[in-house]
Interface confidence: low
């Protein structure tokens, strides 16, 4: 009878992460008697994957019923494959011996390659907000993919970006890889509704790339423009002064009215109106009783937006043109905001 040969018909097997790998092995003879073992790698440092005779190998199942006396199929299935399972697997026949079994013959080996999908790209922007015309950096990271070849693209509102740098690590051979990319984006005043998208294409994704997004609303700060105007009201001795706060983002805003440098009232923007571009408008009124003033009044609208240094706009109110009303010591009355007046 011819000497037993251990035949591993597949020189290589390619499996997607999470799936089951089938490693085929057949023997040409039932003699010599003894078990089959599977190893990953060769030499003294090899890793035992399956022992027909003993041991517990929860991820491994056999293709055939190894209890049958005539079995010569020693193929195994390894479940829930991960990139860490990549390597060359050897089917090894042992001769039954005393006290120990003796290695008899090994198959030629089957190289298991694992295709692992990249993780969903995570896009992160700068820690602090920036204003239009500034350039900000966004990073995109994806991990755990194999093989190493991968394509990463950046988009802003569907338009591909070109100013970015990408690295895939590690440079050498590895069971899996990571990609890190940094893109530079110039902000505009219209970017509140904009999105930055990182798109990753990999052989495991079958033409359906993964995308990670960042909303520029988390990154941009559009400072407000201020306009202070004076409007007469019904009573001759009252003047309505309006501070229009336009085109700001985010909403966090505090407004202070000053009369001749003294704080008259402070309020926080609450009910604002939203513009199509995502920025906000807000309006505050101050009702000034000019009869309480002997001299001209300098009214200042001071706005602190999103924790930034205050900006202000002033308006000089001439009191000489208005008749004085005796007995009134109230210089200004609080008004509501958001286009509401309370008298």
């Amino acid at each position: 009878e011819e000497e037993l040969q251990v035949i591993q018909p597949d020189k290589s097997v390619l499996v997607a992460a999470g799936e089951t790998a089938t490693l085929r092995c057949t023997a040409t003879s039932l003699i010599p008697v003894g078990p089959i073992q599977w190893f990953r790698g060769a030499g003294p440092g090899r890793e035992l994957i399956y022992n027909q005779k003993e041991g517990h190998f929860p991820r491994v199942t056999t293709v055939s019923d190894l209890t049958k006396r005539n079995n010569m199929d020693f193929s195994i299935r390894i479940g829930n494959i991960t990139p860490a399972d990549a390597g060359t697997y050897y089917c090894v026949k042992f001769r039954k011996g005393s006290p120990d079994d003796v290695e008899f013959k090994s198959g030629a080996g089957t190289e298991l390659s694992v295709r692992a999908k990249p993780s969903a790209p995570v896009v992160s922007g700068p820690a602090a907000r920036a204003t239009p015309q500034h350039t900000v950096s966004f990073t995109c990271e994806s991990h755990g993919f194999s093989p190493r070849d991968i394509t990463l693209k950046w988009f802003k509102n569907g338009n591909e970006l070109s100013d970015f740098q990408t690295n895939v690590d590690p440079v050498g051979e590895s069971v899996s890889y990571s990609i890190h990319s940094t893109a530079k984006v110039v902000l505009t005043r219209e970017d509140v509704h904009s999105q930055v998208i990182c798109e990753v294409a990999h052989v495991t994704l079958q033409g359906d790339p993964l995308r990670g997004t960042a909303n520029l609303s988390e990154t941009i700060r559009v400072p407000p423009t201020l306009e202070v105007t004076q409007q007469p009201v019904r009573a001759e001795n009252q003047v309505n002064v309006t501070c229009q706060v336009r085109k700001f983002y985010p909403q966090r805003l505090q407004l202070t009215w000053l009369e001749n440098g003294n704080v008259s009232r402070t309020e926080t923007a609450s009910t604002v109106t939203e513009n199509k571009d995502g920025t906000y408008n807000w309006m505050s009124w101050l009702l000034v009783n000019v009869s309480a003033h002997r001299d001209d009044v300098k009214l200042t609208c001071q706005v602190e937006h999103d924790g930034q240094p205050a900006v202000s706009k002033s308006h000089d109110l001439k009191v000489s043109a208005h008749p004085k009303e005796q007995g009134s010591n109230t210089a200004a009355e609080n008004t509501g905001s958001n286009e509401r007046n309370i008298y």
């Epitope: 040969q5 035949i7 018909p9 597949d10 020189k11 057949t26 010569m72 030629a108």
Partner: antibody
Amino acid sequence: AVTLDESGGGLQTPGGGLSLVCKASGFDFSNFNMAWVRQGPGKGLEYVAEISDTGSTPYYGSAVQGRATISRDNGQSTVRLQLNNLRAEDTGTYFCTRNFGSSVSSIDAWGHGTEVIVSS
Amino acid sequence: AVTQPASVSANPGETVRITCSGDSSSYYSWHQQKSPGSAPVSVIYSNTDRPSDIPSRFSGSASGSTATLTITGVQAEDEAVYFCGAYDSSSDSDIFGAGTTLTVL
């Protein structure tokens, strides 16, 4: 490109023997099992014999078992099929195949074939 | 033995599936032959693998003891006889199906 060139066919006498040779090129010959598959006139394909990449293990189809010998020379990149005690039913085109693994389930390349006619 | 249909037909652009059923065969290959006696061409081997020079419209799958050759978007040049090859692990034998004639209408 993988090329498999068969030779040795022709008119053969019943009861006699033939020797077919397949010359391979375009790949690492010693890494692949090689096999012979034949096709009778107006018939389907039939597995004849196979040999492992090292040449140590031959396999034979039931129709030629005991009459055929398959061998290989990895240095010359050739595989040989010797078929004795020829019968009329051995008539057909004999193809040399490259097997990615072993068995017909892994045939990934074919030669152009050589025609064998067994007739008196 | 392995069994495959004697013939199938399809219009250009359609998807064609040819099955091959064995008793206990686990591993299959598919081969295209355009005329009797001419050299077959392997389109699928080891159940699902496709030689590098074969168009991607050819794909293979196997479940249990049945294998399927799928041609997605069949073309006129795909008209041929398709043989499945099977390794029967129960009898340790290599066998071919009788062939399926594909006609592209």
